[in-house]
Protein backbone atom coordinates (compact mmCIF):
# COMPACT_ATOMS: atom_id res chain seq x y z
CA UNK A 1 0.00 0.00 0.00
CA UNK A 2 1.39 2.87 -1.08
CA UNK A 3 0.02 6.16 -0.31
CA UNK A 4 0.05 8.36 -3.38
CA UNK A 5 1.01 11.76 -2.01
CA UNK A 6 3.97 9.82 -0.57
CA UNK A 7 5.35 9.46 -4.60
CA UNK A 8 5.36 12.86 -4.58
CA UNK A 9 9.05 14.10 -3.40
CA UNK A 10 7.67 17.52 -2.38
CA UNK A 11 5.51 15.59 0.06
CA UNK A 12 9.21 15.00 1.37
CA UNK A 13 10.59 17.95 1.40
CA UNK A 14 7.48 19.73 2.78
CA UNK A 15 7.33 17.33 6.23
CA UNK A 16 11.18 17.58 6.54
CA UNK A 17 10.88 21.99 6.00
CA UNK A 18 8.24 21.53 8.85
CA UNK A 19 10.49 19.67 10.85
CA UNK A 20 13.55 21.71 10.25
CA UNK A 21 11.29 25.19 10.91
CA UNK A 22 10.48 23.45 14.28
CA UNK A 23 13.84 22.64 14.99
CA UNK A 24 14.86 26.10 14.23
CA UNK A 25 12.62 27.73 16.76
CA UNK A 26 13.99 25.68 19.47
CA UNK A 27 14.79 28.00 22.37
CA UNK A 28 16.41 26.19 25.31
CA UNK A 29 13.93 27.34 28.14
CA UNK A 30 16.81 28.61 31.15
CA UNK A 31 14.68 28.50 33.68
CA UNK A 32 15.04 26.08 36.75
CA UNK A 33 12.43 23.21 36.65
CA UNK A 34 9.16 23.42 39.39
CA UNK A 35 8.27 19.99 38.78
CA UNK A 36 10.23 16.80 37.35
CA UNK A 37 8.19 13.72 35.94
CA UNK A 38 10.22 10.47 34.24
CA UNK A 39 8.19 8.14 32.55
CA UNK A 40 10.08 5.11 32.62
CA UNK A 41 9.36 2.49 29.77
CA UNK A 42 10.82 -0.91 31.99
CA UNK A 43 12.32 -2.83 28.82
CA UNK A 44 11.54 -0.26 26.23
CA UNK A 45 14.15 -0.47 23.99
CA UNK A 46 14.16 0.94 20.63
CA UNK A 47 13.00 -1.88 18.52
CA UNK A 48 9.98 -1.72 20.65
CA UNK A 49 9.11 1.85 20.39
CA UNK A 50 8.92 1.65 16.86
CA UNK A 51 7.21 -1.53 17.09
CA UNK A 52 4.54 0.09 19.33
CA UNK A 53 4.44 3.01 16.80
CA UNK A 54 3.26 1.08 14.21
CA UNK A 55 0.54 -0.53 16.21
CA UNK A 56 -0.56 2.47 17.53
CA UNK A 57 -0.96 3.80 14.23
CA UNK A 58 -2.59 0.81 13.02
CA UNK A 59 -5.15 1.53 16.27
CA UNK A 60 -5.73 4.72 14.26
CA UNK A 61 -6.55 2.80 10.25
CA UNK A 62 -3.28 4.83 9.20
CA UNK A 63 -0.21 2.55 7.85
CA UNK A 64 1.46 2.92 11.31
CA UNK A 65 5.40 4.55 10.91
CA UNK A 66 4.20 7.96 10.12
CA UNK A 67 1.94 8.67 13.28
CA UNK A 68 4.18 9.83 16.13
CA UNK A 69 4.09 8.77 19.70
CA UNK A 70 3.78 11.45 22.27
CA UNK A 71 7.32 10.23 23.22
CA UNK A 72 8.03 11.36 19.88
CA UNK A 73 6.96 14.65 20.45
CA UNK A 74 9.29 15.55 22.61
CA UNK A 75 12.25 17.54 21.05
CA UNK A 76 15.21 17.01 22.71
CA UNK A 77 17.09 13.22 22.77
CA UNK A 78 19.82 10.93 24.13
CA UNK A 79 21.30 8.05 23.89
CA UNK A 80 22.00 6.27 27.27
CA UNK A 81 24.40 3.40 28.06
CA UNK A 82 22.63 1.23 30.62
CA UNK A 83 25.59 -1.63 31.66
CA UNK A 84 25.80 -2.41 35.58
CA UNK A 85 29.15 -1.65 37.10
CA UNK A 86 29.57 -5.83 36.94
CA UNK A 87 27.39 -6.35 34.11
CA UNK A 88 27.03 -6.03 30.37
CA UNK A 89 23.71 -6.73 30.04
CA UNK A 90 21.36 -4.85 33.04
CA UNK A 91 18.75 -5.96 35.41
CA UNK A 92 16.26 -3.14 36.62
CA UNK A 93 17.32 -3.09 40.03
CA UNK A 94 20.73 -0.90 39.29
CA UNK A 95 19.20 0.77 36.61
CA UNK A 96 17.03 2.37 38.52
CA UNK A 97 19.94 3.14 40.72
CA UNK A 98 21.75 4.87 37.63
CA UNK A 99 19.05 7.49 36.30
CA UNK A 100 16.97 7.71 40.02
CA UNK A 101 20.38 8.42 42.14
CA UNK A 102 22.65 8.64 39.24
CA UNK A 103 25.39 6.35 40.61
CA UNK A 104 25.85 3.08 38.64
CA UNK A 105 25.36 -0.72 41.17
CA UNK A 106 25.60 -3.81 40.36
CA UNK A 107 23.53 -6.75 38.84
CA UNK A 108 19.65 -6.85 41.09
CA UNK A 109 20.94 -4.18 44.30
CA UNK A 110 18.91 -1.49 44.13
CA UNK A 111 20.09 2.36 46.10
CA UNK A 112 23.39 1.19 46.55
CA UNK A 113 26.83 1.61 44.95
CA UNK A 114 28.80 -0.42 43.11
CA UNK A 115 30.55 -1.20 46.98
CA UNK A 116 27.47 -3.30 47.62
CA UNK A 117 27.67 -6.83 46.53
CA UNK A 118 24.26 -8.92 45.43
CA UNK A 119 22.44 -10.42 48.45
CA UNK A 120 25.74 -9.54 51.20
CA UNK A 121 23.19 -8.09 53.77
CA UNK A 122 26.56 -6.56 55.77
CA UNK A 123 27.96 -4.70 52.59
CA UNK A 124 24.59 -2.19 52.57
CA UNK A 125 25.35 -0.12 55.38
CA UNK A 126 27.46 2.99 54.32
CA UNK A 127 26.88 2.38 50.44
CA UNK A 128 23.58 3.78 50.38
CA UNK A 129 23.12 6.63 47.60
CA UNK A 130 20.08 9.07 47.73
CA UNK A 131 17.36 9.14 44.85
CA UNK A 132 16.55 12.49 43.32
CA UNK A 133 12.42 11.87 44.45
CA UNK A 134 14.10 11.84 47.88
CA UNK A 135 16.06 15.02 47.28
CA UNK A 136 12.78 16.33 45.61
CA UNK A 137 11.03 15.78 48.94
CA UNK A 138 14.10 17.24 51.06
CA UNK A 139 13.44 20.31 49.02
CA UNK A 140 9.72 20.40 49.70
CA UNK A 141 8.34 19.50 46.57
CA UNK A 142 5.55 16.45 46.61
CA UNK A 143 6.33 13.27 45.43
CA UNK A 144 4.99 9.88 44.04
CA UNK A 145 5.52 6.96 42.61
CA UNK A 146 2.83 4.72 40.03
CA UNK A 147 4.00 1.80 38.14
CA UNK A 148 2.07 -1.25 36.07
CA UNK A 149 4.02 -3.78 38.27
CA UNK A 150 3.92 -4.28 43.00
CA UNK A 151 5.24 -0.88 43.82
CA UNK A 152 7.90 -2.85 45.15
CA UNK A 153 9.16 -4.08 42.61
CA UNK A 154 12.84 -3.27 41.01
CA UNK A 155 12.54 0.34 39.54
CA UNK A 156 9.85 2.28 41.60
CA UNK A 157 11.97 0.66 44.36
CA UNK A 158 15.01 2.86 43.08
CA UNK A 159 13.33 5.91 44.30
CA UNK A 160 12.74 4.88 48.07
CA UNK A 161 15.00 1.77 48.97
CA UNK A 162 18.68 0.57 49.22
CA UNK A 163 18.89 -3.17 49.22
CA UNK A 164 21.56 -5.32 47.98
CA UNK A 165 18.70 -7.99 46.41
CA UNK A 166 16.09 -6.87 44.45
CA UNK A 167 13.68 -10.35 45.12
CA UNK A 168 13.36 -9.14 48.79
CA UNK A 169 9.96 -7.90 48.53
CA UNK A 170 8.23 -9.13 51.73
CA UNK A 171 10.22 -10.15 55.37
CA UNK A 172 9.07 -13.31 54.26
CA UNK A 173 11.95 -13.25 51.03
CA UNK A 174 14.31 -11.93 53.39
CA UNK A 175 16.91 -14.53 54.57
CA UNK A 176 16.91 -14.84 58.39
CA UNK A 177 20.50 -14.00 58.55
CA UNK A 178 19.96 -10.96 56.55
CA UNK A 179 17.06 -10.13 58.82
CA UNK A 180 19.35 -10.66 62.07
CA UNK A 181 21.87 -8.52 59.75
CA UNK A 182 19.18 -5.41 60.02
CA UNK A 183 18.56 -5.22 56.28
CA UNK A 184 14.81 -4.72 55.76
CA UNK A 185 12.50 -5.88 52.92
CA UNK A 186 11.57 -3.30 50.27
CA UNK A 187 7.86 -2.99 51.60
CA UNK A 188 9.35 -2.21 54.92
CA UNK A 189 11.18 0.51 53.43
CA UNK A 190 8.65 1.76 51.37
CA UNK A 191 6.69 3.03 54.32
CA UNK A 192 9.80 3.94 56.63
CA UNK A 193 12.44 5.65 54.74
CA UNK A 194 11.23 8.70 53.06
CA UNK A 195 7.38 10.32 53.05
CA UNK A 196 5.96 9.40 49.98
CA UNK A 197 3.08 11.86 48.50
CA UNK A 198 1.39 9.00 46.30
CA UNK A 199 1.92 5.65 45.92
CA UNK A 200 -0.01 4.01 43.14
CA UNK A 201 0.17 0.10 41.27
CA UNK A 202 0.33 -3.39 42.92
CA UNK A 203 1.72 -4.99 45.64
CA UNK A 204 -0.92 -5.44 48.48
CA UNK A 205 0.01 -8.98 49.13
CA UNK A 206 3.68 -7.86 50.80
CA UNK A 207 2.01 -5.37 53.21
CA UNK A 208 -0.10 -7.78 55.46
CA UNK A 209 1.08 -10.43 57.55
CA UNK A 210 0.53 -14.40 56.39
CA UNK A 211 -3.31 -15.06 56.42
CA UNK A 212 -4.59 -12.04 55.90
CA UNK A 213 -7.22 -12.53 52.86
CA UNK A 214 -7.20 -10.28 49.73
CA UNK A 215 -10.22 -8.21 49.51
CA UNK A 216 -9.83 -8.85 45.85
CA UNK A 217 -9.57 -12.76 46.35
CA UNK A 218 -10.69 -13.50 49.59
CA UNK A 219 -10.48 -17.35 48.45
CA UNK A 220 -7.11 -17.65 47.08
CA UNK A 221 -4.86 -18.18 49.88
CA UNK A 222 -1.98 -17.36 47.25
CA UNK A 223 -3.08 -13.90 47.24
CA UNK A 224 -3.02 -12.95 50.61
CA UNK A 225 -0.53 -11.11 52.78
CA UNK A 226 3.05 -12.66 52.88
CA UNK A 227 4.38 -11.01 55.76
CA UNK A 228 6.30 -13.32 58.94
CA UNK A 229 6.37 -10.34 61.25
CA UNK A 230 2.60 -9.52 61.45
CA UNK A 231 2.75 -6.36 60.45
CA UNK A 232 -0.42 -4.61 58.61
CA UNK A 233 1.96 -1.93 56.82
CA UNK A 234 -0.93 0.16 55.14
CA UNK A 235 -2.36 0.46 58.76
CA UNK A 236 1.31 1.86 60.10
CA UNK A 237 1.56 3.81 56.81
CA UNK A 238 -2.08 5.64 57.29
CA UNK A 239 -1.19 5.87 61.34
CA UNK A 240 1.64 8.11 60.75
CA UNK A 241 0.23 10.67 58.53
CA UNK A 242 -2.87 12.86 58.47
CA UNK A 243 -4.74 13.16 55.62
CA UNK A 244 -4.01 9.65 54.21
CA UNK A 245 -5.86 7.39 52.24
CA UNK A 246 -5.67 3.73 50.88
CA UNK A 247 -7.68 2.46 48.24
CA UNK A 248 -7.93 -0.38 46.16
CA UNK A 249 -9.96 -0.09 43.83
CA UNK A 250 -10.58 2.33 40.44
CA UNK A 251 -13.75 3.82 42.14
CA UNK A 252 -12.22 4.48 45.36
CA UNK A 253 -9.01 5.74 43.66
CA UNK A 254 -10.82 8.29 41.67
CA UNK A 255 -12.97 9.51 44.94
CA UNK A 256 -9.76 10.01 46.87
CA UNK A 257 -7.88 12.16 43.96
CA UNK A 258 -10.93 14.17 43.85
CA UNK A 259 -10.95 15.05 47.57
CA UNK A 260 -9.20 18.05 49.06
CA UNK A 261 -8.79 16.50 52.53
CA UNK A 262 -6.70 13.58 50.84
CA UNK A 263 -3.47 14.61 51.32
CA UNK A 264 -1.33 10.92 50.89
CA UNK A 265 -3.16 8.49 48.55
CA UNK A 266 -1.74 5.11 48.75
CA UNK A 267 -3.41 2.66 45.81
CA UNK A 268 -2.56 -0.87 45.88
CA UNK A 269 -4.28 -2.71 42.80
CA UNK A 270 -3.80 -5.71 42.74
CA UNK A 271 -1.69 -8.49 45.16
CA UNK A 272 1.17 -8.77 42.82
CA UNK A 273 1.52 -6.95 39.63
CA UNK A 274 -1.04 -5.29 37.96
CA UNK A 275 -2.69 -7.06 35.18
CA UNK A 276 -1.98 -6.73 31.60
CA UNK A 277 -4.09 -3.84 29.79
CA UNK A 278 -5.35 -6.25 27.80
CA UNK A 279 -6.46 -8.25 30.69
CA UNK A 280 -6.90 -5.24 33.03
CA UNK A 281 -11.12 -5.10 34.34
CA UNK A 282 -11.55 -1.60 33.90
CA UNK A 283 -14.53 -1.37 36.54
CA UNK A 284 -11.60 -2.91 39.17
CA UNK A 285 -8.49 -1.42 37.88
CA UNK A 286 -7.34 1.71 36.64
CA UNK A 287 -5.41 1.99 34.07
CA UNK A 288 -1.86 3.13 34.01
CA UNK A 289 -3.39 6.78 32.34
CA UNK A 290 -5.99 6.72 35.21
CA UNK A 291 -3.32 6.39 37.60
CA UNK A 292 -0.79 9.01 36.26
CA UNK A 293 -3.87 11.41 36.13
CA UNK A 294 -5.22 10.94 39.88
CA UNK A 295 -1.34 11.23 40.98
CA UNK A 296 -0.89 14.59 39.13
CA UNK A 297 -4.30 15.95 40.67
CA UNK A 298 -2.76 15.70 43.80
CA UNK A 299 0.73 16.74 43.23
CA UNK A 300 -0.11 19.62 41.72
CA UNK A 301 -1.51 21.26 44.79
CA UNK A 302 2.01 21.76 46.42
CA UNK A 303 3.23 25.58 45.18
CA UNK A 304 6.80 24.19 45.25
CA UNK A 305 5.74 21.83 42.66
CA UNK A 306 6.36 18.05 42.48
CA UNK A 307 8.60 14.70 41.63
CA UNK A 308 6.54 12.29 39.93
CA UNK A 309 7.74 8.15 38.95
CA UNK A 310 5.61 6.61 36.09
CA UNK A 311 6.71 3.44 35.28
CA UNK A 312 5.16 1.04 32.33
CA UNK A 313 6.38 -1.86 33.96
CA UNK A 314 5.19 -4.85 32.13
CA UNK A 315 6.56 -4.21 28.67
CA UNK A 316 9.32 -5.94 30.45
CA UNK A 317 7.49 -8.76 31.17
CA UNK A 318 5.69 -9.17 27.85
CA UNK A 319 8.77 -9.61 26.41
CA UNK A 320 10.36 -12.32 29.22
CA UNK A 321 7.61 -14.34 27.95
CA UNK A 322 8.13 -13.28 24.21
CA UNK A 323 4.64 -12.29 23.91
CA UNK A 324 4.89 -9.46 21.78
CA UNK A 325 1.43 -8.67 21.68
CA UNK A 326 1.37 -8.08 25.61
CA UNK A 327 4.87 -5.86 25.70
CA UNK A 328 3.31 -3.64 22.52
CA UNK A 329 0.02 -3.21 24.13
CA UNK A 330 1.55 -2.15 27.44
CA UNK A 331 3.86 0.37 25.63
CA UNK A 332 0.99 1.64 23.90
CA UNK A 333 -1.12 2.41 27.48
CA UNK A 334 2.44 3.90 29.15
CA UNK A 335 2.72 6.72 25.84
CA UNK A 336 -1.03 7.24 27.01
CA UNK A 337 -0.26 8.05 30.05
CA UNK A 338 2.85 10.26 28.53
CA UNK A 339 0.41 12.16 26.12
CA UNK A 340 -2.19 13.07 29.39
CA UNK A 341 0.97 13.92 31.56
CA UNK A 342 1.12 16.67 28.94
CA UNK A 343 -2.16 17.76 28.74
CA UNK A 344 -2.03 18.22 32.35
CA UNK A 345 0.78 20.41 32.91
CA UNK A 346 2.88 22.46 31.43
CA UNK A 347 6.73 22.68 29.56
CA UNK A 348 7.19 25.90 30.72
CA UNK A 349 7.82 24.67 34.59
CA UNK A 350 7.54 20.73 34.54
CA UNK A 351 10.62 18.55 32.87
CA UNK A 352 9.04 15.67 31.47
CA UNK A 353 11.77 12.89 30.46
CA UNK A 354 10.87 9.26 28.86
CA UNK A 355 13.22 6.40 28.69
CA UNK A 356 14.23 2.73 29.48
CA UNK A 357 16.06 1.12 32.25
CA UNK A 358 16.85 -1.57 29.21
CA UNK A 359 15.81 -3.07 25.85
CA UNK A 360 15.08 -6.79 25.40
CA UNK A 361 16.44 -9.30 22.31
CA UNK A 362 13.65 -8.03 20.21
CA UNK A 363 13.78 -7.64 16.43
CA UNK A 364 11.32 -6.58 13.85
CA UNK A 365 12.84 -7.41 10.74
CA UNK A 366 11.77 -9.50 7.37
CA UNK A 367 11.39 -6.78 4.82
CA UNK A 368 7.32 -6.34 5.80
CA UNK A 369 5.07 -4.47 3.25
CA UNK A 370 3.88 -0.91 4.85
CA UNK A 371 0.35 -0.90 6.26
CA UNK A 372 0.92 -4.94 7.53
CA UNK A 373 0.31 -6.12 10.94
CA UNK A 374 2.90 -5.78 12.77
CA UNK A 375 2.15 -8.95 14.37
CA UNK A 376 1.79 -10.98 10.74
CA UNK A 377 4.28 -12.59 8.84
CA UNK A 378 7.18 -12.00 6.23
CA UNK A 379 6.79 -12.24 3.14
CA UNK A 380 8.44 -15.44 1.73
CA UNK A 381 9.30 -18.25 3.40
CA UNK A 382 12.61 -19.40 5.55
CA UNK A 383 15.20 -21.61 4.32
CA UNK A 384 13.13 -24.55 6.27
CA UNK A 385 10.18 -23.21 3.94
CA UNK A 386 8.15 -22.11 6.19
CA UNK A 387 7.04 -18.81 7.49
CA UNK A 388 8.35 -16.42 10.12
CA UNK A 389 7.16 -13.34 11.73
CA UNK A 390 8.63 -9.82 11.34
CA UNK A 391 8.64 -9.94 14.94
CA UNK A 392 11.33 -12.05 16.82
CA UNK A 393 13.42 -12.72 20.30
CA UNK A 394 16.75 -13.81 20.01
CA UNK A 395 16.23 -16.04 23.17
CA UNK A 396 13.43 -17.22 25.26
CA UNK A 397 10.47 -19.50 26.08
CA UNK A 398 9.36 -18.73 22.32
CA UNK A 399 11.56 -20.81 21.51
CA UNK A 400 9.71 -24.68 20.38
CA UNK A 401 10.51 -28.06 18.20
CA UNK A 402 8.20 -30.03 16.70
CA UNK A 403 9.06 -32.90 15.77
CA UNK A 404 12.47 -31.79 16.06
CA UNK A 405 11.93 -29.03 13.99
CA UNK A 406 10.83 -25.01 13.48
CA UNK A 407 7.08 -25.44 13.80
CA UNK A 408 5.48 -23.56 11.21
CA UNK A 409 3.54 -20.24 11.69
CA UNK A 410 0.18 -18.87 10.48
CA UNK A 411 -1.32 -15.03 9.89
CA UNK A 412 -3.97 -15.93 13.09
CA UNK A 413 -1.58 -18.08 15.51
CA UNK A 414 0.77 -15.04 15.36
CA UNK A 415 -2.01 -12.55 15.64
CA UNK A 416 -3.37 -14.10 18.82
CA UNK A 417 -2.39 -11.86 22.03
CA UNK A 418 -1.02 -15.36 23.53
CA UNK A 419 1.71 -16.12 20.61
CA UNK A 420 5.01 -16.51 21.87
CA UNK A 421 7.49 -15.18 18.89
CA UNK A 422 9.89 -17.56 17.84
CA UNK A 423 13.71 -17.45 19.15
CA UNK A 424 16.99 -18.85 18.42
CA UNK A 425 17.78 -20.33 22.10
CA UNK A 426 15.42 -21.68 24.28
CA UNK A 427 15.11 -20.18 27.95
CA UNK A 428 12.51 -20.08 30.71
CA UNK A 429 12.41 -15.58 30.36
CA UNK A 430 13.77 -14.13 27.35
CA UNK A 431 16.44 -11.81 27.91
CA UNK A 432 17.45 -7.72 28.53
CA UNK A 433 19.58 -6.66 25.89
CA UNK A 434 22.33 -4.47 26.32
CA UNK A 435 22.14 -1.44 23.63
CA UNK A 436 21.96 1.54 24.33
CA UNK A 437 17.98 2.94 24.85
CA UNK A 438 16.42 6.70 24.13
CA UNK A 439 16.04 9.77 26.37
CA UNK A 440 13.09 11.99 25.47
CA UNK A 441 13.33 15.17 27.18
CA UNK A 442 11.11 18.11 26.85
CA UNK A 443 10.55 21.18 29.79
CA UNK A 444 13.08 22.87 31.64
CA UNK A 445 17.12 22.13 30.67
CA UNK A 446 15.71 19.38 28.82
CA UNK A 447 18.36 20.82 26.03
CA UNK A 448 21.24 19.09 28.16
CA UNK A 449 19.84 15.77 27.27
CA UNK A 450 22.26 15.61 24.54
CA UNK A 451 24.58 12.65 22.76
CA UNK A 452 25.32 9.31 24.18
CA UNK A 453 25.47 9.71 27.81
CA UNK A 454 25.77 7.17 30.72
CA UNK A 455 22.45 6.01 32.43
CA UNK A 456 23.32 8.14 35.48
CA UNK A 457 23.39 11.36 33.72
CA UNK A 458 19.53 11.03 33.52
CA UNK A 459 19.63 11.52 37.71
CA UNK A 460 21.74 14.29 37.10
CA UNK A 461 19.94 16.13 35.11
CA UNK A 462 16.97 15.65 36.94
CA UNK A 463 18.47 17.12 39.95
CA UNK A 464 20.30 20.32 38.28
CA UNK A 465 17.08 21.20 36.30
CA UNK A 466 15.22 21.66 39.87
CA UNK A 467 18.04 22.92 41.74
CA UNK A 468 18.35 20.14 44.12
CA UNK A 469 21.40 18.39 45.98
CA UNK A 470 24.24 18.63 44.68
CA UNK A 471 23.00 21.37 42.33
CA UNK A 472 21.53 23.88 44.79
CA UNK A 473 23.57 26.66 43.37
CA UNK A 474 22.32 25.79 39.90
CA UNK A 475 22.17 29.77 39.06
CA UNK A 476 18.85 29.59 37.30
CA UNK A 477 15.94 31.82 36.97
CA UNK A 478 12.61 30.17 39.09
CA UNK A 479 10.14 29.28 36.55
CA UNK A 480 7.06 31.08 36.10
CA UNK A 481 4.47 30.71 38.96
CA UNK A 482 6.72 29.40 41.89
CA UNK A 483 6.49 30.62 45.30
CA UNK A 484 8.86 30.16 47.61
CA UNK B 1 23.67 -23.63 50.88
CA UNK B 2 20.61 -23.69 48.94
CA UNK B 3 18.43 -27.15 49.21
CA UNK B 4 15.79 -28.72 46.81
CA UNK B 5 13.98 -31.21 47.85
CA UNK B 6 11.34 -33.18 45.29
CA UNK B 7 8.69 -35.45 46.60
CA UNK B 8 5.12 -37.21 45.47
CA UNK B 9 6.84 -39.49 42.86
CA UNK B 10 5.88 -43.04 42.14
CA UNK B 11 4.35 -46.04 40.70
CA UNK B 12 0.92 -44.92 38.89
CA UNK B 13 -1.26 -46.63 35.84
CA UNK B 14 -1.74 -45.40 32.83
CA UNK B 15 -4.28 -42.37 32.90
CA UNK B 16 -3.97 -42.01 36.55
CA UNK B 17 -2.50 -38.84 38.10
CA UNK B 18 -0.12 -37.37 40.52
CA UNK B 19 1.14 -34.42 42.15
CA UNK B 20 4.88 -33.58 42.97
CA UNK B 21 6.00 -30.94 44.55
CA UNK B 22 9.87 -29.39 45.27
CA UNK B 23 10.61 -27.28 48.50
CA UNK B 24 13.22 -25.07 48.71
CA UNK B 25 15.40 -24.25 51.57
CA UNK B 26 15.39 -20.38 51.99
CA UNK B 27 13.75 -17.77 50.16
CA UNK B 28 15.61 -18.62 46.73
CA UNK B 29 12.57 -19.16 44.82
CA UNK B 30 11.90 -14.97 45.59
CA UNK B 31 11.98 -13.33 42.12
CA UNK B 32 12.79 -16.49 40.33
CA UNK B 33 11.66 -18.66 37.79
CA UNK B 34 11.18 -22.00 38.68
CA UNK B 35 10.06 -25.11 36.81
CA UNK B 36 10.62 -29.02 36.16
CA UNK B 37 12.87 -31.07 34.09
CA UNK B 38 12.89 -34.60 33.93
CA UNK B 39 15.03 -37.72 32.25
CA UNK B 40 14.16 -40.93 31.12
CA UNK B 41 16.41 -44.14 31.40
CA UNK B 42 19.14 -43.81 28.64
CA UNK B 43 17.56 -40.51 27.51
CA UNK B 44 18.94 -37.01 27.81
CA UNK B 45 17.01 -34.58 30.40
CA UNK B 46 14.04 -32.86 29.06
CA UNK B 47 12.46 -29.41 30.19
CA UNK B 48 8.95 -30.33 30.99
CA UNK B 49 7.89 -26.84 32.37
CA UNK B 50 8.18 -23.46 34.08
CA UNK B 51 6.54 -20.69 35.97
CA UNK B 52 8.09 -16.82 36.11
CA UNK B 53 8.11 -15.08 39.80
CA UNK B 54 4.60 -13.76 38.80
CA UNK B 55 3.09 -16.42 37.70
CA UNK B 56 3.31 -16.96 33.85
CA UNK B 57 3.52 -20.39 32.52
CA UNK B 58 5.21 -22.31 30.17
CA UNK B 59 5.11 -26.05 29.21
CA UNK B 60 6.59 -28.56 26.72
CA UNK B 61 4.67 -29.59 24.06
CA UNK B 62 4.58 -33.06 25.22
CA UNK B 63 2.90 -32.53 28.29
CA UNK B 64 0.40 -29.90 27.25
CA UNK B 65 -3.14 -29.74 28.65
CA UNK B 66 -2.05 -32.80 31.00
CA UNK B 67 0.55 -30.98 33.22
CA UNK B 68 0.03 -27.79 35.77
CA UNK B 69 2.79 -26.13 37.16
CA UNK B 70 1.77 -23.95 40.21
CA UNK B 71 3.78 -22.19 42.91
CA UNK B 72 3.02 -20.93 46.36
CA UNK B 73 5.94 -18.28 47.11
CA UNK B 74 5.04 -18.12 50.83
CA UNK B 75 5.93 -21.88 50.80
CA UNK B 76 8.68 -21.97 48.33
CA UNK B 77 7.32 -24.46 47.14
CA UNK B 78 6.40 -25.39 43.27
CA UNK B 79 4.20 -28.19 42.16
CA UNK B 80 3.40 -29.82 38.80
CA UNK B 81 -0.01 -31.66 38.70
CA UNK B 82 0.14 -34.71 36.21
CA UNK B 83 -3.05 -35.99 34.68
CA UNK B 84 -4.06 -38.61 32.07
CA UNK B 85 -0.33 -39.89 32.76
CA UNK B 86 1.28 -42.10 30.03
CA UNK B 87 3.57 -44.90 29.67
CA UNK B 88 6.10 -42.46 28.63
CA UNK B 89 6.30 -40.19 31.13
CA UNK B 90 7.98 -42.59 32.72
CA UNK B 91 11.29 -40.48 34.42
CA UNK B 92 13.21 -38.85 37.06
CA UNK B 93 11.67 -35.75 37.64
CA UNK B 94 13.82 -33.14 38.75
CA UNK B 95 13.06 -29.18 39.90
CA UNK B 96 15.17 -26.29 39.12
CA UNK B 97 15.24 -22.39 40.00
CA UNK B 98 16.26 -20.38 36.79
CA UNK B 99 17.97 -16.92 38.53
CA UNK B 100 18.76 -14.21 35.92
CA UNK B 101 22.05 -13.64 34.85
CA UNK B 102 23.69 -16.51 37.26
CA UNK B 103 26.22 -19.20 36.00
CA UNK B 104 25.29 -21.04 39.16
CA UNK B 105 22.75 -23.59 38.51
CA UNK B 106 19.98 -24.91 41.73
CA UNK B 107 18.43 -28.48 41.59
CA UNK B 108 17.17 -31.03 43.17
CA UNK B 109 17.80 -34.57 43.73
CA UNK B 110 14.86 -35.75 41.63
CA UNK B 111 11.92 -38.37 42.78
CA UNK B 112 10.66 -40.70 40.25
CA UNK B 113 7.20 -41.42 38.62
CA UNK B 114 6.76 -44.54 37.15
CA UNK B 115 3.87 -45.57 34.72
CA UNK B 116 2.89 -48.63 33.99
CA UNK B 117 0.58 -49.70 30.73
Known amino acids: IIPVEEENPDFWNREAAEALGAAKKLQPAQTAAKNLIIFLGDGMGVSTVTAARILKGQKKDKLGPEIPLAMDRFPYVALSKTYNVDKHVPDSGATATAYLCGVKGNFQTIGLSAAARFNQCNTTRGNEVISVMNRAKKAGKSVGVVTTTRVQHASPAGTYAHTVNRNWYSDADVPASARQEGCQDIATQLISNMDIDVILGGGRKYMFRMGTPDPEYPDDYSQGGTRLDGKNLVQEWLAKRQGARYVWNRTELMQASLDPSVTHLMGLFEPGDMKYEIHRDSTLDPSLMEMTEAALRLLSRNPRGFFLFVEGGRIDHGHHESRAYRALTETIMFDDAIERAGQLTSEEDTLSLVTADHSHVFSFGGYPLRGSSIFGLAPGKARDRKAYTVLLYGNGPGYVLKDGARPDVTESESGSPEYRQQSAVPLDEETHAGEDVAVFARGPQAHLVHGVQEQTFIAHVMAFAACLEPYTACDLAPPAGTTD | QVQLVESGGGLVQAGESLRLACAAS????????VGWYRQAPEKQREWVSS???????DYAEAVKGRFTISRDNAKNTVYLQMNSLKPEDTAVYYC???????????WGQGTKVTVSS
Open chain 2, 51 to 57: ITDYGDT
Open chain 2, 26 to 33: GTIFSGNA
Open chain 2, 96 to 106: YVYQRGESEEY
